[in-house]
């Protein structure tokens, strides 16, 4: 088995759809607004959830943040970049009472949270601690800081076909 799973050639970092509030740190909004309906022919793989032209995978197994990152990459996806309020609500609606790693990390040098596509997160992260540099969602209605080394479930995200 490989640690560094190969990613699909079509893999692109999540971009936000439409204008969003600044705290979600959107990176390149679409001028077309939110995609609210499933368009004809768009498909997510088995066991993935469709929302706004994206596919989401919620794992049942648990792993560290780094291993979660590799897992998502191996599926041609990234850890979820939850950069719109709508996306957050959608994910909160489908998560169990469990913690799920997302693609949000704390950069100690600049003392700020960033999504893994480098866009800044200006919102609130609860449970902050000097050793908690990764983030989860799911158990509460907030973004929670967590140890990157503890094993949690994960949410992966990629483009719908």
């Amino acid at each position: 088995p490989q640690i560094f799973n190969k990613s699909n050639d079509g893999f692109t970092t999540t971009r936000s759809y439409g204008t969003v509030s600044q705290i979600f740190g959107s990176s390149s909004p679409s001028p077309n607004g939110f995609i609210t309906t499933r368009s004809y022919g768009t498909v997510c793989p088995k066991d993935w959830e469709f929302y706004q032209a994206r596919c989401f995978f919620l794992s049942t197994s648990e792993s560290s943040w780094n291993e979660s990152r590799d897992f998502c990459k191996g599926k041609g996806s990234t850890l979820a970049i939850v950069n719109t309020p709508e996306k957050l609500k959608f994910l909160q609606d489908i998560t169990d009472a469990e913690k799920y790693f997302i693609g949000l990390i704390y950069h100690r040098e600049e003392k700020r949270w960033r999504w893994i596509n480098n866009s800044v997160f200006n919102g609130n992260v609860t449970n902050q601690n000097q050793n908690f540099n990764c983030a989860t969602i799911g158990l509460t209605k907030t973004f929670d800081a967590a140890s990157c080394d503890i094993s949690y479930r994960r949410i992966c995200e990629k483009n719908a076909k």
């Epitope: 088995p1 490989q2 640690i3 780094n66 080394d149």
Partner: antibody, heavy 119, light 107 residues
């Protein structure tokens, strides 16, 4: 203070074997991916082996696959690299490195141990 | 495997110069790029991860940027202690690969 100290390098004949060790201290060894990176005489860097935190998953590039084996003993805070069927092109300075918190970049490097393969 | 083509191989600099090193990936690596500094007789040291994030304790004269295939590493004002070899590295895909290095030398 994070410390990685390699040992076990030396001069080996073509086709020979050697085992490198890396003693880690100053951090929770069992929580981190660890890797071996080598630097060839022309100063190029190459990842030669990686292992996840519990030792259950390993990775090797094609250049060393089947010849090198990475392992770890979390109780002893030690990383190993068993090398066999050595070739002259394996001659390099071998670094024990710790993977970063957010990916497979390397935030701590040992001082290195030298392997020389003679033909 | 992904090839990281680093340019230039050598750079002649004077103290106070602004220096730019580029790394071009043979395919998109998103922002999964790190930069390292290796001084003579020393091990490499991590400077930048995720293309633009300075590692803890790294002076702010060192910056990184880029996304996809083209990445830039800049030293805004070179100091004598910056004379070293600089390497880029991608961890987007296996095998993990490094650039060949750029050596900064005094004019």
């Amino acid at each position: 203070d994070v410390k990685l100290v390699e040992s076990g390098g030396g001069l080996v004949k073509l086709g020979g074997s050697l085992k490198l060790s890396c003693a880690a201290s100053g951090f929770t060894f069992s929580s981190y991916y660890m890797s071996w990176v080598r630097q060839t005489p022309d100063k190029r860097l190459e990842l030669v082996a990686a292992i996840n935190s519990n030792g259950g998953t390993t990775y090797y590039p094609d250049t060393v696959k089947g010849r090198f084996t990475i392992s770890r003993d979390n109780a002893k805070n030690t990383l190993y690299l068993q090398m066999s069927s050595l070739k002259p092109e394996d001659t390099a300075l071998f670094y024990c490195v710790r993977d970063g918190e957010f990916g497979h970049y390397f935030d701590y490097w040992g001082q290195g141990t030298t392997l020389t393969v003679s033909s | 495997s992904i090839v990281m083509t680093q340019t230039p191989k050598f750079l002649l600099v004077s103290a106070g110069d602004r220096v730019t090193i580029t790394c071009k990936a043979s395919q998109s690596v998103n922002n999964d790029v790190a930069w390292y500094q290796q001084k003579p007789g020393q091990s490499p040291k991590l400077l930048i991860y995720y293309a633009s994030n300075r590692y803890t304790g790294v002076p702010d004269r060192f910056t990184g940027s880029g996304y996809g295939t083209d990445f830039t590493f800049t030293i805004s004002t070179v100091q004598a202690e910056d004379l070293a070899v600089y390497f880029c590295q991608q961890d987007y895909n296996s095998p993990l690969t490094f650039g060949a290095g750029t050596k900064l030398e005094l004019k």
